[in-house]
């Protein structure tokens, strides 16, 4: 057993059929010694006396908020969590897999630019009595501050006969360094809390490995006389790492129709132009990536051919 | 050339050569990005290898004010992983497939190194670890981790050879 | 399967105009780019221009600019190149060749020799 | 018009040797490079698109690199089929342009 924080504890239970379970023992936070009494929720059942109550806690209809009273007075509340452990694995029941970039991805994040700053996001199909608490730091060993805010419901979306709610939370680094190579992990520990089972999920990374920049932005087209051709120009996005010249990014143009299937023109470059061919009910459209470092390519920025 | 005395380095060479060592260091093992290594127990093998850090001069400013000791760093790092590169690591078993760019690797790490000084000159490099896997699957792990690692280190690299020769040339 | 089918062997004097065709099978046509691609005896590849046949488009190599004429048929599924003024270095094989993506060449046909001599 | 020029213009080597082909550009064109194999009296055919992407049906021995000015065609452990001639293709611009060839034969 160990305390989540004040008066809340999470008590890890080997979960198989007839487990013997963990024994707990409770002490009511009082100077009192005599007449104490315990309950558990809302029940009026004294479930024994004394300023400690032992209890054999082997499924969930043992934890909740165990309280201590005297004489119709409240002395205090210990909530009690469980986190199972299924053969030797900590239970994931709250999230959902993501399966990207690998199965057993409950937790995904991304970083716009290198200032240290990066958001993570999470599914569950759960949709009430469910917090999050969420702790971040560079390296374990020695960690340096990373601060998170709280965690936000950020979408929601059915998914078949389900619903599935997407949170997310923002985090920077106290003391970021853009220009440096890392060589500790960020590390990102959730702790959920459905009713009363308790589950943890972490996730540990390089920011280099998570950038993912906004797409290019104020995509302009200029066509070139006598010819199919047309240039199309962009800027970097705002919230690339800046100067240019260091944070460099490399673009992907293409020209697609509304369909993947359609035929497309294609070009890579480092520049902020490109002189490609503009088809009838196309789009050209550009992304972006790290110039030195094969992280995720950006979404598309894309205008009308005509 | 960056000569230990302070004079500037050819920017546009080392420009053109690091992006290459860029591609290469990700065409060594494009696959290297999608294993999650850190769950291997890295200590003893990346907290051995210099890392350009947030002291070293190599951020825009710091470059601006004295591209030196970021240079030498860089240096120190080309050194290291050329001879991590042409160690028992990469030589052992299992071989490398005979296509692998290791080699060209290796080669375009010993030329940026050179760019950066000249024979007759030297600056400090950093002891490389006696880092001697017994087992074929060892040696394999701590090639993705060296790559990987090596990725890191161009990255920066290149950004600190873009910027110089788009600011800092003659 | 994506086939592209060429016409026979042409031999012509200098000052004449040659067109050859491509009959294009296993896609539908106005889904790929054509282009020409032609090669001299012993000599590497040269591009010479491309049609999209969904709209008639054409784009041509400035060198062949004024001389060639690329055209598509939608309703026989079959591209034409026309090259006028010919001369002795315009001996070569031509091939068509087709893809989805504009700028590089997946499918290709079978070439056809054209002869120039007086 | 990029001019792209490859090296050497032929090579002589044995079954199960590795032979690499490189191609230059006279100007910078990123990753937009192809490779093709043409045997005699074939059309050519793709081996490789946009520097080191593979190309489905195209055996594994195939291996591209580069990006800028320089690229590598690779082929490892040279097989019997493979002895032909090489091209590589830039597409940064048009007119599209042809290296101009690197014959592979047997030694």
């Known amino acids: 057993i160990w305390e989540l924080k004040k008066d809340v504890y999470v008590v890890e239970l080997d979960w198989y059929p007839d487990a013997p379970g963990e024994m707990v023992v409770l002490t009511c936070d009082t100077p009192e010694e005599d007449g104490i009494t315990w309950t558990l929720d809302q029940s009026s059942e004294v479930l024994g006396s004394g300023k400690t109550l032992t209890i054999q806690v082997k499924e969930f209809g043992d934890a909740g908020q165990y309280t201590c009273h005297k004489g119709g007075e409240v002395l205090s509340h210990s909530l009690l969590l469980l986190h199972k452990k299924e053969d030797g694995i900590w239970s994931t029941d709250i999230l959902k897999d993501q399966k990207e970039p690998k199965n057993k991805t409950f937790l995904r994040c991304e970083a716009k630019n290198y200032s240290g700053r990066f958001t993570c996001w999470w599914l569950t199909t759960i949709s009430t009595d469910l917090t999050f608490s969420v702790k971040s730091s560079r390296g374990s060993s020695d960690p340096q501050g990373v601060t998170c805010g709280a965690a936000t419901l950020s979408a929601e979306r059915v998914r078949g006969d389900n619903k599935e709610y997407e949170y997310s939370v923002e985090c920077q680094e106290d003391s970021a360094c853009p220009a440096a190579e890392e060589s500790l992990p960020i590390e990102v520990m959730v702790d959920a809390v459905h009713k009363l089972k308790y589950e943890n999920y972490t996730s540990s990374f390089f920011i280099r490995d998570i950038i993912k920049p906004d797409p290019p932005k104020n995509l302009q087209l200029k066509p070139l006389k006598n010819s199919r051709q047309v240039e199309v120009s962009w800027e970097y996005p705002d919230t690339w790492s800046t100067p240019h010249s260091y944070f460099s990014l490399t673009f992907c143009v293409q020209v697609q129709g509304k369909s993947k299937r359609e035929k497309k023109d294609r070009v890579f470059t480092d520049k902020t132009s490109a002189t490609v061919i503009c088809r009838k009910n196309a789009s050209i459209s550009v992304r972006a990536q790290d110039r030195y470092y094969s992280s995720s390519w950006s979404e598309w920025a894309s205008v009308p051919c005509s | 050339r960056a000569v230990p005395g302070g004079s500037s380095p050819a920017w546009t060479q080392c420009q053109q050569l690091s992006q290459k060592l860029c591609t290469l260091a990700w065409s060594a093992h494009p696959l290297v990005g999608h294993m999650d290594l850190r769950e291997e127990g890295d200590e003893e093998t990346t907290n051995d290898v210099p890392h350009i850090q947030c002291g070293d001069g190599c951020d825009p400013q710091g470059l601006r004010d004295n591209s030196q000791f970021c240079l030498q760093r860089i240096h120190q790092g080309l050194i290291f992983y050329e001879k991590l590169l042409g160690s028992d690591i990469f030589t052992g078993e299992p071989s490398l497939l005979p296509d692998s760019p290791v080699g060209q690797l290796h080669a375009s790490l010993l030329g940026l190194s050179q760019l950066l000084q000249p024979e007759g000159h030297h600056w400090e490099t950093q002891q490389i670890p006696s880092l001697s896997p017994s087992q074929p699957w060892q040696r394999l792990l701590l090639r993705f981790k060296i790559l990987r690692s090596l990725q890191a280190f161009v990255a920066v690299a290149a950004r600190v050879f873009a910027h110089g020769a788009a600011t800092l040339s003659p | 399967e994506v086939q592209l089918v060429q016409s026979g062997a042409e031999v012509k004097k200098p000052g004449a105009t040659v067109k050859i065709s491509c009959k294009a099978s296993?896609?539908?046509?106005?889904?790929?780019?054509l282009h020409w691609v032609r090669q001299a005896p012993e000599k590497g590849l040269e591009w010479m221009g491309w049609i999209d046949p969904e709209n008639g488009d054409t784009e041509y190599a400035p060198k062949f600019q004024g001389r060639v004429t690329i055209t598509a048929d939608t309703s026989t599924d079959t591209g034409y190149l026309e090259l006028s003024s010919l001369r002795s270095e315009d001996t070569a094989v031509y091939y068509c060749?087709?893809?989805?993506?504009?700028?590089?060449?997946?499918?290709w046909g079978q070439g056809t020799l054209v002869t120039v001599s007086s | 018009d990029i001019q792209m020029t490859q090296s050497p213009s032929s090579v002589s080597a044995s079954v199960g040797d590795r032979v690499t082909i490189t191609c230059r550009a006279s100007q910078s064109i990123s990753i937009n490079l192809h490779w093709y194999q043409q045997k005699p009296g074939k059309a050519p055919k793709l081996l490789i698109k946009f520097a080191s992407q593979s190309i489905s049906g195209v055996p594994s021995r195939f291996s591209g690199y580069g990006s800028g000015t320089d690229f590598s065609l690779t082929i490892n452990s040279l097989q019997p089929e493979d002895f032909a001639r090489y091209y590589c293709q830039q597409s940064n611009s048009f007119p599209l342009t042809f290296g101009g060839g690197t014959k592979v034969e047997i030694k």
């Open positions: 296993g896609y539908t046509f106005s889904d790929y780019y």
């Open positions: 060749a087709a893809n989805k993506e504009l700028r590089y060449f997946d499918v």
